[in-house]
């Protein structure tokens, strides 16, 4: 139809940058990260939301690949597993150079667009991946991390997660501890996007009050449309507007309709609501493909983005608003974060207090001096 044709026309010029895709987790889960396993061929990969033909059909021009290690690795092998997941993203990009271009900057994304490749960036999903260490944080930056989700679905010693708001976790940091504040400041200094998906409302607010640059929600939807605590409430959306930040809508059925079933139109309802409260410049896409068990009817995999864009056009979104949601908003935020970075400024050095450091299998070098 007309709107589908228009969507494709727009996306040829302005492909989608998606904020969160868990294909790297699937590569671990299905193949233990053995990309040369013949079943792991990304051109023919079956049983996932994501493969190369689907990315092409969906006009995906940029992807933050999720580097995720589960919460039960906290205080155990979280850092090792984080490094292994970063490695699998790097290897994936090298193995399919005609499809993926590994990039670490907004300029790199634009370069990938020019080359017709999928700009491939690393987002680290969960603050437990840094093991409460600013040194680990800086090392992950050197290895390509360009966003850090402050928590996954567990508290860290320095930030609270969304389950605090459901009553399933106890608040520990009242948003951000003093060390958590240092993490936020260091992310600003490095030029790493701060991701507030999965965090508690108190952590959202504390971070939006502290960060000097815009932040993102890499895969979260609108609480007023579906009252899941993984979604963003309106008072926070107003702070998103003030700070030129970005909410990249998650497609998981239970965060879209608050039931096991959802459809594309209901996803558009979330996009409409965020646009209404925070403005069109605050809207993006973070489908969470390959990270969720149920996706909406009409958004079965990454090939379906043009159908969602067609629905927005049908709802009288302007071409500029659609292009914003596809790519321009994320590029604007990323550029602001890059401009706010200051690698000549002294790095944060004060470590987390020993009594706040979780886990029993630790040495205490440095703390006694």
């Amino acid at each position: 139809d007309f709107f589908r044709d228009e969507a494709e026309r727009i996306m040829r010029d302005s492909p989608v940058i998606d904020g969160h895709n868990d294909l790297p987790w699937q590569l671990l889960d299905m193949f233990n990260n053995r990309l040369q396993d013949e079943r792991a061929n990304l051109t023919t990969l079956a049983g996932t939301h994501t493969n190369i033909p689907k990315l092409r059909a969906g006009f995906v021009g940029g992807q933050f690949w999720s580097v995720y290690t589960p919460c039960d690795t906290q205080n155990k092998d979280a850092v090792r597993r984080t490094l292994e997941q970063m490695d699998v993203v790097h290897r994936m990009c090298r193995m399919y150079p005609e499809t993926f271009l590994y990039v670490t900057s907004s300029a790199g994304i634009r370069q990938a667009f020019r080359e017709g490749k999928v700009a491939s960036l690393i987002g680290v999903e969960g603050g437990h991946s840094i093991d409460s260490s600013l040194g680990v944080l800086r090392a992950l930056y050197q290895l390509g991390m360009r966003y850090l989700t402050l928590t996954h679905s567990c508290n860290t010693p320095w930030a609270d997660n969304w389950l605090v708001d459901t009553g399933d976790s106890e608040p520990q940091s009242q948003g951000l501890s003093p060390f958590g504040q240092r993490v936020v400041k260091e992310l600003n200094r490095l030029g790493v996007l701060i991701d507030l998906a999965h965090v508690s409302v108190a952590t959202m607010k504390a971070t939006l009050q502290l960060s000097r640059a815009p932040v993102i929600f890499s895969h979260s939807s609108a609480y007023s449309v579906c009252a899941s605590r993984r979604n963003v409430p309106d008072d926070v959306l107003r702070l998103v507007k003030q700070t030129d930040s970005l909410v990249m809508v998650n497609f998981y059925n239970n965060y879209i309709s608050c039931t096991n079933k959802a459809n594309l139109s209901q996803v558009a309802d979330h996009l409409d609501h965020i646009k209404e409260v925070a403005g069109a410049r605050a809207v993006g896409f973070g489908g969470d493909f390959d990270g969720v068990p149920r996706v909406p009817e009409g958004l079965e995999d990454v090939s379906k983005y043009p159908d969602l864009i067609a629905e927005l056009l049908r709802r009288n979104w302007t071409e500029a608003e659609v292009k914003g949601a596809l790519a321009d908003n994320l590029l604007r935020v990323f550029e602001a974060v890059e401009q706010a970075s200051n690698l000549t400024q002294a790095p944060e050095e004060e470590p987390i207090p020993l009594d706040q450091l979780g886990g029993s299998c630790r040495t205490h070098y440095g703390y006694s001096s």
């Epitope: 640059a213 700070t243 030129d244």
Partner: nanobody
């Protein structure tokens, strides 16, 4: 180094108006969100209002909403606080503060320690 100078304070009757100014001498405020704070005798300093870099986005504490208006003139490097319907409880020393940010709005809840530059303050007294 940004130097902020407040002016416009004074003694005013209940229900009256004042317009405070916060001027930056020899430096630009273009890249700074600006907030007005106040401290009444024996009380902690509290935020009153803030305005983003371009002036298009602002916010207000509940206690002054509908009575106070913040604005800025970047060409003059000055931020204004128009205070109407003043009450005795508005009596305080009013100070402006500047915070370097890379977004266009402002966040009222940002802690005082996150502001980079402060003025000396101007006294506002509202008589009953």
């Amino acid at each position: 180094e940004v130097q902020l100078v407040e002016s416009g304070g004074g003694l005013v009757e209940y229900g009256g108006s004042l317009r405070l100014s916060c001027a930056a001498s020899e430096s630009t405020l273009d890249n700074y969100a600006i907030a007005w704070f106040r401290q009444a005798p024996g009380k902690e300093r509290e935020v009153v209002s803030c305005v983003g870099k371009s002036g298009g986005r602002s916010d207000y504490a509940d206690s002054v909403k509908g009575r106070f208006t913040i604005s800025r003139d970047n060409a003059k490097n000055t931020v204004y606080l128009q205070m109407n319907s003043l009450k005795p409880e508005d009596t305080a020393v009013y100070s402006c503060a500047a915070r370097r940010v890379w977004f266009g709005g402002c966040v009222l809840g940002t802690s005082q320690g996150q502001y980079d530059y402060w003025g000396q303050g101007t006294q506002v007294t509202v008589s009953s």
